[in-house]
Amino acid sequence: QQQTLPKPFIWAEPHFMVPKEKQVTICCQGNYGAVEYQLHFEGSLFAVDRPKPPERINKVKFYIPDMNSRMAGQYSCIYRVGELWSEPSNLLDLVVTEMYDTPTLSVHPGPEVISGEKVTFYCRLDTATSMFLLLKEGRSSHVQRGYGKVQAEFPLGPVTTAHRGTYRCFGSYNNHAWSFPSEPVKLLVTGDIENTSLAPEDPTFPADTWGTYLLTTETGLQKDHALWDHTAQNLLR
């Protein structure tokens, strides 16, 4: 006899990185017929939703109108059908950005390099932080962590055309509170003609994942679809 229901899916719209004072929606998708959903934050009950009519709804949305550091952290959700509760969802790491200051991102030997050259990014922030994050636009929101008192270095090693793209960095005050993003640095990697022509534009970040984050940052615009990114989420853990 089944003691629990399958776990629901949880994600943030438009993005798990939320500029402070902007809005975000946490979505939880369970099963049709669920009479109650609970959203938990850092182990405590955060919010409840009872869909109506339950037999026609399999997803609820929890709205956070005003993101701040108190709401940054790990969320999970559960749902109930009758008296039977589900397993908890995976953890959603909700990050507040635009805290305090803006780091400076630079690249050595420069933004235009030849395939095979060693490239290092430097992220500098003079306020009290020791963890830095380097993000590259593309399909998987690739996040690298670096450590240092005011500056972290991110050696990419010998680069290939797959390293081409736009990079930004953040200072991290804790796992869930990040600085403003740095200005972007576009890395151009040239190889021999044959390799370059065959190399696709690096697909490491959904085309509109970063764009959606920037829209949220600049205008508060919300997009009503999931841009859930497991790679970046897992790297937060």
Epitope: S44, A47, V48, K52, V60, K61, I64, P65
Partner: nanobody, 126 residues
Framework: EVQLVESGGGEVQPGGSLRLSCAAS????????MGWFRQAPGKGREFVAA???????YYAESVKGRFTISRDNAKNTLYLQMSSLRAEDTAVYYC????????????????????WGQGTLVTVKP
């Protein structure tokens, strides 16, 4: 901008009743999820009850069956009817709002609320 003003607090004997009110300014009351929290002397702020825009309610276990939360959107007012009061209910009671929100969202965690009143004191003693 939402302003919340609580009233109705006072001194009452154990087993007695009180009704707290929270008057909200502005036209956003109907689009707000609302809640009551309390803070006893020397303790942290504690969730009491909450209500969604669509009148779904949720209660702390310690007040379930004794307290009732309700709202009157026409009057921009939130209520907390308290009965069978106990000494441990003595606290400053705060009204809070989440604006805006979805219709069925009920918020339990204090971090979710973006507007707060100044509080009204409820004292339960013989």
């Amino acid at each position: 901008e939402v302003q919340l003003v609580e009233s109705g607090g006072g001194e009452v004997q154990p087993g007695g009743s009180l009704r707290l009110s929270c008057a909200a300014s502005g036209r956003t009351f109907a689009s707000a999820a609302m809640g009551w929290f309390r803070q006893a002397p020397g303790k942290g702020r504690e969730f009491v009850a909450a209500i969604s825009r669509s009148d779904d309610t949720y209660y702390a276990e310690s007040v379930k069956g004794r307290f009732t939360i309700s709202r009157d959107n026409a009057k921009n007012t939130l209520y907390l009817q308290m009965s069978s009061l106990r000494a441990e209910d003595t606290a400053v009671y705060y009204c809070a709002a989440v604006v805006p929100t979805y219709g069925n969202n009920i918020y339990v965690h204090s971090a979710a609320y973006n507007y707060w009143g100044q509080g009204t004191l409820v004292t339960v003693k013989p």
